[in-house]
């Protein structure tokens, strides 16, 4: 008989990443018969929810339903109706909600309560809304990139399926930068750790991994900027803050109440003789870099080696994938190429930050001014964090790969989270039977 293709049994999953600055909905799909194979799940859609992060809805929770509507309706369109009831939906909230919970557990729960109420109105199988830990965020990001890079598959290939794939099974480290926190996760050379808080052990596809991870709350790019402003306004002689991290000619009024709203600025809080101050950009990379370095306390370390603020960091090992805002910022600045050295990146940042604001606005007319104005700070912050915070060097810089997507799927914690919660990462290597995955008769 002639070979006929059978309709493939496809499954779907939805994960909402409720970040500090915005929420994104990701839709994943995979062949049902292959769910224990490595590398078969891929992203079919990303929908960015219009508006800020869910923590900003704390005083207007009744608007959360409308906020989520467009992307949930998009999911309804993308996923075949016959699959709706079977499709799991997860929402994970990250550092923005961790900060809200620090201020008020009750308010954080109220937000999540309304999120569940809203998501339960859709035909999908809602599994839960929760605030994930920083450790989970780091670990799931690490799982995502290594899953997509094929690092967990035991089959050695003579060809490379993705640009960063070396043929060895050495895992990539994961560098994740959000608005409110940043994570570093990798397998260190030395398996014994001085800090059990930073140690994770996984058995994936029949192999054991001893992983180091840490999440730095308040060191995402947006909260780091608030910290820097709060620190610098302490020593300002009046209500004008001449700021090297903004372009020359840039001006912006900041409310002191907004500055002190976040728990991240508490350590710098003081009574100021004004309610508002004006940022005036002077566009000087070197001075901006110096100002940023003051956010990292490197004077105290109770371990053999630390990142900053007394947090253990083992010696860096292997290649790293840097994603989320690490990628978005560096991609905007056109600095993601593997060929660009750290010295060249610094040079380009110096040039970029010194460009007049009017010139920048003209060159990037399509970009929202709020975002555009912060790229000088964000780029400088990324360099400072990677070099002084995590101790990358000019030589080890070439081991950092700025990654947006891997084979069409966004790098980030959401895929790893779904793989874990749907039990699609087996501890043991699945036995492959030659006929079990056939779609032909």
């Amino acid at each position: 008989t002639q070979n006929k293709a059978l309709p493939e049994n496809i499954k779907y999953g939805i994960v909402l990443d409720a970040g500090s600055s915005h929420t994104s909905l990701y839709i994943y799909k995979w062949p049902a018969e292959k769910e224990n194979d490595t590398g078969v799940v891929h992203q079919v859609e990303e929908c960015r929810v219009k508006g800020p992060g869910i923590s900003k809805y704390v005083q207007k929770v009744n608007e959360i339903g409308i906020y989520l509507t467009d992307c949930m309706e998009r999911a309804r369109e993308v996923i075949p109706r016959s699959q709706h009831q079977e499709t799991p939906v997860y929402l994970g909230a990250t550092a923005g909600m961790r900060l809200l919970r620090m201020e008020s557990e009750e308010l954080a729960d109220r937000v999540l309560d309304v999120v569940e109420r809203s998501l339960s109105n859709y035909p999908f199988d809602f599994q839960g809304a929760r605030i994930i830990t920083g450790q989970e965020e780091g670990a799931y990001g690490w799982i995502t990139i290594n899953y997509l890079l094929g690092k967990f598959s035991q089959k050695t290939r003579w060809f490379s399926i993705v640009p960063y794939e070396t043929n060895n099974q050495e895992t990539f480290g994961a560098l994740d930068l959000g608005g409110a926190s940043t994570q570093i996760t990798f397998v260190p050379q030395n398996q014994t750790t001085e800090s059990p808080d930073n140690a994770l052990q996984f058995r994936l596809y029949g192999k054991d991994y001893n992983v180091y991870t840490h999440s730095f709350l308040c060191y995402g790019k947006d909260q780091a900027l608030w910290q820097k402003l709060a620190k610098d306004i302490q020593v300002a002689s009046n209500e004008i803050l001449r700021d090297p991290c903004f372009h020359p000619g840039y001006k912006k009024v900041v409310n002191v109440s907004d500055l002190y709203k976040t728990p991240c600025t508490k350590r710098f809080e003081m009574t100021l003789p004004f309610q508002q101050f004006e940022i005036q950009g002077i566009g000087n990379y070197q001075q901006c870099h110096q100002s940023v370095l003051e956010l990292f306390n490197t004077s105290y370390c109770p371990y053999s080696q630390c990142a900053f603020n007394g947090i253990f960091l083992p010696p860096l090992q292997g290649d790293f994938g840097a994603f989320s805002a690490f990628y978005f910022v560096m991609n905007f600045l056109n600095l993601t190429s593997e060929k660009v050295s750290q010295e060249k990146v610094t040079e380009m940042m110096k040039k970029f930050c010194s460009q007049p604001w009017e010139e920048i606005k003209t060159s990037y007319a399509g970009v929202k001014e709020k975002y555009l104005s912060e790229y000088c700070f964000s780029g400088t912050y990324i360099l400072s964090l990677l070099l002084q915070g995590y101790h990358f060097t000019a030589d080890s810089w070439e081991h950092i790969h700025f990654i947006g997507k891997i084979q069409g799927s966004d790098a980030g914690w959401t895929l790893g989270y779904m793989l874990n919660l749907t039990n699609m990462i087996p501890a043991e290597q699945p036995l492959s039977t030659p006929l079990s995955h056939s779609t032909y008769v």
Partner: nanobody, 126 residues
Framework: EVQLLESGGGLVQPGGSLRLSCTVS????????MGWFRQAPGQERDFVTA????????HYADSVKGRFTISRDNSKNTVYLQMNSLKPEDTAVYYC???????????????????WGQGTQVTVSS
């Protein structure tokens, strides 16, 4: 791992009411769907009802719809089962169940990883 402690079982006449409680220690309570299952002598454990983390989704077995109500109080880490119009066939050991980041629908199918309480006896007899 969460720990579950049931209370409220006992002997009741047909047509009577009973309220079971299940208190959870350890874990973040709102991250768990909670449910009740029952096992009559010589029978398998059967699904009765389940509720989502913040209480907006509930599922009931057909045999108890309209008579039993599940609810939760996240401030007390407690889930309740209000049982009205009890019948002799409701006699069983009732087990509280918790499933992390799992829908009530999946609990109904006994899918995912479920943590069980010790069980409390409910006897409906005149």
């Amino acid at each position: 791992e969460v720990q579950l402690l049931e209370s409220g079982g006992g002997l009741v006449q047909p047509g009577g009411s009973l309220r079971l409680s299940c208190t959870v220690s350890r874990g973040t309570f709102s991250e768990y769907s909670m449910g009740w299952f029952r096992q009559a002598p010589g029978q398998e454990r059967d699904f009765v009802t389940a509720i989502s983390g913040f209480g907006h989704i509930t599922h009931y077995a057909d045999s108890v719809k309209g008579r039993f109500t599940i609810s939760r109080d996240n401030s007390k880490n407690t889930v309740y089962l209000q049982m009205n119009s009890l019948k002799p066939e409701d006699t069983a050991v009732y087990y509280c169940a918790a499933a992390w980041q799992t829908s009530p629908r999946r609990m109904m199918q006994m899918a995912g990883s479920i943590t069980w309480g010790q069980g409390t006896q409910v006897t409906v007899s005149s």
